[in-house]
């Protein structure tokens, strides 16, 4: 579990001068966070989500301090990089530096792989992750995105069971779900989520979230989201925040109804949806007649099934 690269709290921690009361308070909070993080390595993954929630809470607190700390940013980012390298070296348990490690598409980007397409991420024995084929978006908004979901052809059904959503399904070159276990591992460090959508009229929209975490299987791959930015109208994923993942054979929603069976997908169903990005793909002509389609209520409402969707993630501290 790697939550070390948490950019904002790390800066006040290093600021030795100007010990105003707020900075002292923040230092105490960050110190508390550090102890929690070291304890996290020894604890079972069951405890992980509660720590993430505290991280997110601290993040919101520290953001209030951000304007006072901008002058020190360049000095401390260099120190942060050194700390990151040490932590990654420890995680690798071999002599290679963090620059050599490839965790996701952002790592590949930093190693000058700048062409979007399919890449193989090497296995990581320390993190327990096998070799993984991923599709990297190296262009959008600076690049470095690992795509975790795509809907474009409609040939692959997303009405799948828990095991398939866990392991992943579909073709990495076409429509696919990367797999909750893989997404969970990729979101162990502070991560951003970007959702891109296209309607049947060719309009493009996006939603981006400052923080994205997927819990582990013990926590039913629960979704945690930070702040929303974007141009897709209302935020239709916030309703699903802090909600467990459900599939047709595992009902973890907050409803008497079995949302996964009603909405015909696997998703973080609440009761049931403000969005349903893993819903049924409906083609033009059928796209505006169904409640179980690929929907984003804040844009086209509850019965408009989108033509194309991509969900992608990259580290919060990624710099193109």
């Amino acid at each position: 579990q790697k939550l070390s690269k948490h950019k904002t709290p790390a800066q006040p921690q290093l600021k030795a001068a100007n010990c105003c009361e707020e900075v002292k308070e923040l230092k105490a909070q960050v110190a508390n966070l550090s102890s929690l993080l070291s304890e996290l390595n020894k604890k079972q993954e069951r405890d992980w989500v509660s720590v993430v929630m505290q991280v997110m809470e601290l993040e919101s607190n520290s953001k209030r301090m951000e304007s006072r700390l901008t002058d020190a940013e360049s000095k401390y980012s260099e120190m942060n990089n050194q700390i990151d390298i040490m932590q990654l070296q420890a995680a690798q348990t071999v002599t290679q530096t963090s620059a050599d490690a490839i965790y996701d598409c952002s790592s590949l980007y930093q190693k000058n792989y700048r062409i979007s397409g399919v890449y193989k991420l090497p296995p990581d024995d320390f993190l327990g992750s096998p070799e993984l084929e991923v599709f990297c978006d190296m262009e959008t908004s600076g690049g470095g995105w690992t795509i975790i979901q795509r809907r474009k052809s409609g040939l692959v059904s997303f009405y799948r069971d828990w095991k398939q959503y866990k392991q992943g399904f579909g073709s990495i070159r076409g429509d696919f779900w990367l797999g909750n276990e893989h997404i969970h591992r990729l979101s162990r460090q502070p991560t951003r989520l970007r959702v891109e959508m296209e309607d049947w009229e060719g309009n493009l929209r996006y939603a981006e979230y400052s923080h994205f975490v997927l819990g582990n299987e013990l926590n039913s791959y629960r979704l945690f989201l930070g702040n929303y930015t974007g141009n897709v109208g209302n935020d239709a994923l916030q309703y699903h925040n802090n909600t467990a993942f459900s599939t047709k054979d595992k009902d973890n929603d907050n409803c008497l109804d079995k949302c996964a069976q009603l909405r015909k997908g696997g998703y973080w169903y609440n009761c049931c949806t403000d969005s349903n990005l893993n819903g049924v793909y409906y083609r033009l002509g059928e796209h505006n007649k169904h409640l179980d389609g690929i929907t984003w209520y804040g844009w086209h409402g509850s019965t408009y099934s989108l033509k194309r969707v991509e969900m992608k993630i990259r580290p919060e501290d990624f710099k193109p």
């Epitope: 059904s157 069971d161 073709s171 070159r173």
Partner: antibody, heavy 120, light 107 residues
Framework: QITLKESGPTLVKPTQTLTLTCTFS??????????VGWIRQPPGKALEWLAL???????QYSPSLKSRLTITKDTSKNQVVLTMTNMDPMDTATYYC????????????WGQGTLVTVSS | DIQMTQSPSSLSASVGDRVTITCRAS??????LNWYQQKPGKAPKLLIY???SLQSGVPSRFSGSGSGTDFILTISSLQPEDFATYYC?????????FGGGTKLEIK
Amino acid sequence: QITLKESGPTLVKPTQTLTLTCTFSGFSLSTSGVGVGWIRQPPGKALEWLALIYWNDDKQYSPSLKSRLTITKDTSKNQVVLTMTNMDPMDTATYYCAHNPDYGDFFDYWGQGTLVTVSS
Amino acid sequence: DIQMTQSPSSLSASVGDRVTITCRASQSISSYLNWYQQKPGKAPKLLIYAASSLQSGVPSRFSGSGSGTDFILTISSLQPEDFATYYCQQSFSTPLTFGGGTKLEIK
């Protein structure tokens, strides 16, 4: 070009275990999205899907036969093996293996099939 | 499980005829419907996938339509080699299920 071929016993006694091997060429079962399925057809009857194994070792089974079926793959040998326990005369059928493309759960290439008769 | 019902179960037609075979799903399956042709003693052959997409190498006289629960396979002008049994199959949800088949015979 994609080809598949089933092999295994043509005659099985009741209660015995059937082991069928599908040997394929022209594709790799390590390619994202790809799968190999087994389908059977009793004489003069319709097709019945049995099992499917994907590139990532995800295995799907017909619920009515799940307790009797096991599907495995050997990617390096380009083989998929189906075992079916406790065979019964009702299991007499032609057994096909087929290629499941990376873009959907259907079967675009089929083996020639092998007729398995269950009789004492 | 999703049940697939084909009609008719058998059909007599002549060369040059336009023929339609229907397939009905027990619940909505969007466009996740595929059609196969099988000749005696041979393996099935994929004709149409995703309700209306023609598989590579299949003659254009074959076409598929429909969405939701009702689907149609059309052969616009029957050829001698088209006399066979036709099966529909849903790929919306496991278990994957086939229809009972439609046997197309020479009148």
